[in-house]
């Protein structure tokens, strides 16, 4: 009789993570008597996967009827495959003895595991930035195999070109990770903008995974200020408004100064939203001009999102308004708490 041969017909097998892998092995002879064993890897550090003779291998089942001696098929099925199962599997015939001795090995079957990448996670800069600045976004995805993967960046559907991508590790591994950094130039219109990282992989069957970041979490649009004097609403009263326009985010504190002295501080509440996502707000002051002998310098000072304050001033000409006789004296003489400047916002 011809000497036994161990035949592993498949050089390689590719399986999706979570599925079962069938590794084929047949022998050409019934002799010598002795068990078949399956190993992952070769050499002294090889890992026992299945032993026909003994042991508990909960994930491994034999494909053929192993209780018949004429059965020469020693194929096995390994359930619930993970990337950690990747490697070369050898079907090995042993000769019965004490100890059992390796008689002949198959050529090996390389098992590769197709594992889906994790959902891409996009993260932006730690601090907000203003329009015309360039900010970096990172995208990470892990646990995929094989190594080949495609990553693209988009801003509002337009593909970006300024990015750098790395896939790790460089050498062989059971699974891989991708890391990409894209540079994005901010504009004043970016409050509603999105940055998208798109990952395509063989396991995704043409349906790429996407991770997004909203630029609303990254951008800061500083406000523009305009202080205007409105027509007189009543005798000796002037309405001064401070228009705070096109700012984002909403966090804003406004302080009115009268000749450099703090008159009133308020926080933006009932703002109006523009189509581009920025906000507008208006604050007003009602000034009793008869309470002032000289011109008044009114300053609207705005602190936006914790940034250094910006301000706009308006000179109120007192001489242009005839004073009501004794009104100033009354205010001074009585030491009254009655305010001479009234304000509001909207």
């Amino acid at each position: 009789e011809e000497e036994l041969q161990v035949i592993q017909p498949d050089k390689s097998v590719s399986v999706a993570a979570g599925e079962s892998a069938i590794l084929h092995c047949t022998v050409t002879s019934l002799i010598p008597v002795g068990p078949i064993q399956w190993f992952r890897g070769a050499g002294p550090a090889r890992e026992l996967i299945y032993n026909q003779k003994e042991g508990h291998f909960p994930r491994v089942t034999t494909v053929s009827e192993s209780t018949k001696r004429e059965n020469m098929d020693f194929s096995i099925s390994i359930s619930n495959i993970t990337p950690a199962d990747a490697g070369t599997y050898y079907c090995v015939k042993f000769r019965k003895g004490s100890p059992d001795t390796e008689f002949k090995s198959g050529a090996g079957t390389e098992l590769s595991v197709r594992a889906k990448p994790s959902a891409p996670v996009v993260s932006g800069p730690a601090a907000r930035a203003t329009p015309q600045h360039t900010v970096s976004f990172t995208c990470e995805s892990h646990g995929f195999s094989p190594r080949d993967i495609t990553l693209k960046w988009f801003k509002n559907g337009n593909e970006l070109s300024d990015f750098q991508t790395n896939v790790d590790p460089v050498g062989e591994s059971v699974s891989y990770s991708i890391h990409s950094t894209a540079k994005v130039v901010l504009t004043r219109e970016d409050v509603h903008s999105q940055v998208i990282c798109e990952v395509a992989h063989v396991t995704l069957q043409g349906d790429p995974l996407r991770g997004t970041a909203n630029l609303s979490e990254t951008i800061r649009v500083p406000p523009t200020l305009e202080v205007t004097q409105q027509p007189v609403r009543a005798e000796n009263q002037v309405n001064v408004t401070c228009q705070v326009r096109k700012f984002y985010p909403q966090r804003l504190q406004l302080t009115w100064l009268e000749n450099g002295n703090v008159s009133r501080t308020e926080t933006a509440s009932t703002v109006t939203e523009n189509k581009d996502g920025t906000y507008n707000w208006m604050s007003w002051l009602l000034v009793n001009v008869s309470a002032h002998r000289d011109d008044v310098k009114l300053t609207c000072q705005v602190e936006h999102d914790g940034q250094p304050a910006v301000s706009k001033s308006h000179d109120l000409k007192v001489s242009a308004h005839p004073k009501e006789q004794g009104s100033n004296t009354a205010a001074e003489n009585t030491g009254s708490n009655e305010r001479n400047i009234y304000g509001g916002s909207g």
Partner: antibody
Framework: EVQLVESGGGLVQPGGSLRLSCAAS????????MHWVRQAPGKGLEWVSA???????YYTGSVKGRFTISRENAKNSLYLQMNSLRAGDTAVYYC????????????WGQGTMVTVSS | DIQMTQSPSSLSASVGDRVTITCRAS??????LAWFQQKPGKAPKSLIY???SLHSGVPSKFSGSGSGTDFTLTISSLQPEDFATYYC?????????FGQGTKLEIK
């Protein structure tokens, strides 16, 4: 059903011959190592002989040169030709199938009695 | 030849008892050890192979252990049908050899 049935036992004089047969059913005999085991009256079990799938044969020392194991694949049968029989060969002879991969005995026949006496 | 020695040669026990029979090989036999049960006038029945694997249909009250030269057969809770003679056998190399047997009797 997997079964082994021995036949051919009987009374024979010392120096005589006897041929035991074992008919297998439910499996292909040629695919298994097959054995003969005997048990003298009131004694323990003793392995006698084996034939491998390649036709290789094995014997215990006391029967070497006197007994011959063989098989006939067409009849799915195993045989033990016993020559130069001695009183010490008196026993029940069992036909036994070796296991799938390690030759562990799994199926036994009911046995046939061989008595060597003058 | 490899010698197989069983102990004890006979053993008295009661229904419900747990009993252990030992078998020692004269040299290392890996785990190529089998256990058989035989009742008077009947053919032996295969119980265990490769020291600890149960043959199909054998109840789990039978268990085997050991490797190398020392082996045991344990019956966890004796029933009337378990009173019989038990044999161990090495089948690592020819000639295959049996132990002399352990007769398990009812007390």
């Amino acid at each position: 059903e997997v079964q082994l049935v021995e036949s051919g036992g009987g009374l024979v004089q010392p120096g005589g011959s006897l041929r035991l047969s074992c008919a297998a059913s439910g499996f292909t005999l040629s695919s298994y190592d097959m054995h003969w085991v005997r048990q003298a009256p009131g004694k323990g079990l003793e392995w006698v002989s084996a034939i491998g799938t390649a036709g290789d044969t094995y014997y215990t020392g006391s029967v070497k040169g006197r007994f011959t194991i063989s098989r006939e694949n067409a009849k799915n049968s195993l045989y033990l030709q016993m020559n130069s029989l001695r009183a010490g060969d008196t026993a029940v002879y069992y036909c036994v199938r070796g296991g799938v991969w390690d030759d562990a005995f799994d199926i036994w026949g009911q046995g046939t009695m061989v008595t060597v006496s003058s | 030849d490899i010698q197989m020695t069983q102990s004890p040669s006979s053993l008295s026990a009661s229904v419900g008892d747990r009993v252990t029979i030992t078998c020692r090989a004269s040299q290392d036999i890996n785990n190529y050890l089998a256990w058989f049960q035989q009742k008077p006038g009947k053919a032996p029945k295969s119980l265990i192979y490769t020291a600890s694997s149960l043959h199909s249909g054998v109840p789990s009250k039978f268990s085997g252990s050991g490797s190398g030269t020392d082996f045991t057969l344990t019956i966890s809770s004796l029933q009337p049908e378990d009173f019989a003679t038990y044999y161990c056998q090495q089948y690592v190399s020819y000639p295959y050899t049996f132990g002399q047997g352990t007769k398990l009797e009812i007390k």
